[in-house]
């Protein structure tokens, strides 16, 4: 009896954590392509609120800027170069930095395709409608969880949310 | 809400210069794009370019460099189109709108009322 | 550039008509296209973005589909309102560029 009971539990708590990280394809493309919120959501929202993206905003745009690297002295206006880096800290530690911050979603799929989104929406106002640096822009986050050693989120539509 | 409001019509010699300006509120004027679009009398529309409001970068488009010049004083949140050596070619509806971001991005959902100049001698 | 051509130039229609317009890109623009409605003396107005997304606030008649470089803009029932400029636009390359315009008028 007390074998059975552990077992409805488990199944029971496979259930939970089945539904909490449900995809849902036919959401429309403005709002969370994820199921309505569930214990598994509030908690992904604390960790995003907990995280410090800071460093991976950073590190990815210097990726994106690198690439258009023959643009650099034209305007005068731009703001780049070590703005969100420390004081001799290279692009490598800023890269580790966010991979640490990173670190607290690869167990959670979604929760990780969540912070991508927000790295994401948080870094499209600086390209605006630059299309090509804002496809270069989600080239890099795709690539962000693997250069981390972390497994990336198979079905992640990271321009499905509108930011502002 | 959002509102782009744009100077007033302006009636110009050949050769003169202009500044049309376009007051954005309602929003963070540094998140979004501000396009330029010409309308000539009786004419279709004609994307003239854009200016990142947050780097300040202007991306103009074939038949808009020279004489046309995108600025910004995000202090204020206005951004300027500026028309030098004008010409009678130049008589137009000159509207402002903001570019939309991500799901919506390459569409225009907020416009100002438009500037008519006119150059005439 | 890439240009954009809409046909008709011009139609009539009487309301409660369902009414097609095209737009045709000289390449391929994936999804990147939107439509507008330009009455006289005023600003246009979104109707879709990415060919096929309705805009906020604009009435379930109006549809657009099509993807590449075929698109069209469907009014399935026209109201008096709607006689009016429509434009199509594309943001695919570096420059984007308007349609011609289509003017729908009063049969």
């Known amino acids: 009896m007390v074998k059975l009971s552990i077992l409805v539990a488990l199944l029971g708590a496979l259930l939970v954590v089945a539904s909490a990280t449900r995809w849902d394809p036919d959401r429309g493309s403005r709002g969370s392509r994820w199921d309505a919120p569930s214990r598994g959501d509030d908690q992904c929202q604390r960790q995003l609120q907990r995280a410090n993206l800071r460093p991976c905003e950073e590190h990815i745009r210097q990726r994106v800027e690198k690439e258009q690297e023959q643009e650099q002295d034209e305007y005068p206006y731009i703001q780049r170069g070590s703005r969100g880096q420390r004081p001799g800290e290279s692009d490598e530690d800023q890269e580790q930095r966010c991979c640490n911050e990173l670190n607290r979603f690869q167990n959670n799929q979604r929760c990780m395709c969540q912070a991508l989104q927000q790295i994401l929406q948080n870094q499209s106002f600086r390209f605006q409608q630059d299309r090509s640096q804002l496809h270069q822009m989600e080239r890099e986050l795709r690539n962000l969880p693997q250069n981390c050693g972390f497994r990336s989120p198979s079905r992640c539509d990271l321009s499905s949310r509108t930011p502002y | 809400q959002v509102q782009l409001v744009q100077s007033g019509s302006e009636l110009k010699k050949p050769g003169a210069s202009m500044k049309v300006s376009c007051k954005a509120s309602?929003?963070?004027?540094?998140?979004?794009?501000m396009n330029w679009v010409r309308q000539a009398p009786g004419q279709g529309l004609e994307w003239m370019g854009w200016i990142n409001t947050n780097t300040g970068k202007p991306t103009y488009a074939q038949g808009f460099t020279g004489r046309f010049v995108f600025s910004l004083d995000t202090s204020v949140s206005m951004a300027y189109l500026q028309i030098s050596s004008l010409e009678a070619g130049d008589t137009a509806v000159y509207f402002c709108?903001?570019?939309?971001?991500?799901?919506?991005?390459?569409?225009?959902?907020?416009w100002g009322q438009g500037t008519l100049v006119t150059v005439s001698s | 550039d890439i240009q954009m051509t809409q046909s008709p130039s011009s139609l009539s229609a009487s309301v409660g008509d369902r009414v097609t317009i095209t737009c045709r890109a000289s390449q391929s623009i994936n999804s990147y296209l939107a439509w507008y409605q330009q009455k006289p003396g005023k600003a246009p107005n979104l109707l879709i973005y990415a060919a096929s997304n309705l805009q906020s606030g604009v009435p379930s008649r109006f549809s657009g589909s099509g993807s590449g470089t075929d698109f069209t803009l469907t009014i399935s029932s026209l109201q008096p309102e709607d006689f009016a400029t429509y434009y199509c636009q594309q943001s695919s390359s570096t420059f984007w560029t308007f349609g011609q315009g289509t003017k729908v008028e009063i049969k």
């Open positions: 709108a903001r570019g939309e971001s991500l799901a919506a991005l390459g569409s225009f959902a907020y």
């Open positions: 309602g929003y963070t004027f540094t998140n979004y794009a």
